[in-house]
């Protein structure tokens, strides 16, 4: 006898994807960066 | 709202095949978590399970009726359909369809009405 | 396949007083994903059955507080702690662990 399957044969995995802005000296314009899994 | 309804004949006579459909709102047969199954009741006895379809069409069967059951799916007429061979008056009962989502609640969470077939010549 | 036995098979009970239906399996319900798949489900007189309590313990949606289930591995209790008259009824254990899918043969709940 097999097990019931209760999984969907896949999963889907998310990223978080931050956005930050960040001042540079008295330049008021602002640098974004994207960060995807942890990694800039 | 989800909700299941069974559909079918309600007499058939022996050496028949017996064809039931499940009709399903609420919830598409094609969602990779759920899943539905046909379950049997005789008249004042348990429950029995009698085949089940996932949503890439895998089908599992009783062990004991396997080889007169048949399942499948229409997913756009949102549709699963029960073909059973070789009728006998044993096989009288109400007839349900149920579904599971899998993994939570891992249970059949929501049941049809079921329909009642009476095998008999 | 694995078989689920229930106990006791009928019980009359006292309306205000609790109530206990045990539910053995033949092997352990434990699945490969850690998760046990034992459910309880009510049938009430004329009616298709209801989902109750799924993966042992947990309370469907909609189902009063006063139905509890317990358990682990083979065994396994569904509780009512102040039976009231809509509890009347037909009530199963029944396993999603293993194939093919079984359930216990039905234990009685009636009032004295």
């Known amino acids: 006898d097999a097990e019931f399957r209760h999984d969907s044969g896949y999963e889907v995995h998310h990223q978080k994807l931050v956005f930050f802005a960040e001042d540079v000296g008295s330049n008021k314009g602002a640098i974004i960066g994207l960060m995807v899994g942890g990694v800039v | 709202q989800v909700t299941l309804k069974e559909s079918g004949p309600v007499l058939v006579k022996p050496t028949e095949t017996l064809t039931l459909t499940c009709t399903v709102s609420?919830?598409?047969?094609?969602?990779?978590?759920?899943?539905v199954s046909w379950i049997r009741q005789p008249p004042g006895k348990a429950l029995e399970w009698l085949a089940h379809i996932f949503s890439n069409d895998e089908k599992s069967y009783s062990t004991s009726l396997k080889s007169r059951l048949t399942i499948s799916k229409d997913t756009f007429k949102s549709q699963v359909v029960l073909t059973m061979t070789n009728m006998d008056p044993v096989d009288t009962a109400t007839y349900y369809c149920?579904?599971?989502?899998?993994?939570?609640?891992?249970?059949?969470?929501?049941w049809g009405q079921g329909t009642m077939v009476t095998v008999s010549s | 396949e694995i078989v689920m036995t229930q106990t006791p098979l009928s019980s009359p009970v006292t309306l205000g007083q609790p109530a206990s239906i045990s539910c053995r399996s033949s092997?352990?319900?434990?699945?490969?994903?850690?998760?046990?798949?034992l459910s309880w489900l009510q049938q009430r007189p004329g009616q298709p059955p209801r989902l109750l309590i799924y993966k042992i313990s947990n309370r469907f949606s909609g189902v009063p507080d006063r139905f509890s289930g317990s358990g682990a591995g083979t065994d396994f209790t569904l509780k009512i702690s102040r039976v009231e008259a809509e509890d009347v009824g037909v009530y199963y254990c029944?396993?999603?662990?293993?194939?093919?899918?079984?359930f216990g043969q039905g234990a009685r709940l009636e009032i004295k």
């Open positions: 029944m396993q999603t662990t293993q194939l093919p899918l079984t």
């Open positions: 092997q352990s319900l434990v699945h490969s994903d850690r998760n046990t798949y």
């Open positions: 149920a579904r599971i989502p899998l993994r939570s609640p891992g249970a059949f969470d929501i």
């Open positions: 609420g919830f598409s047969l094609s969602n990779a978590r759920m899943g």
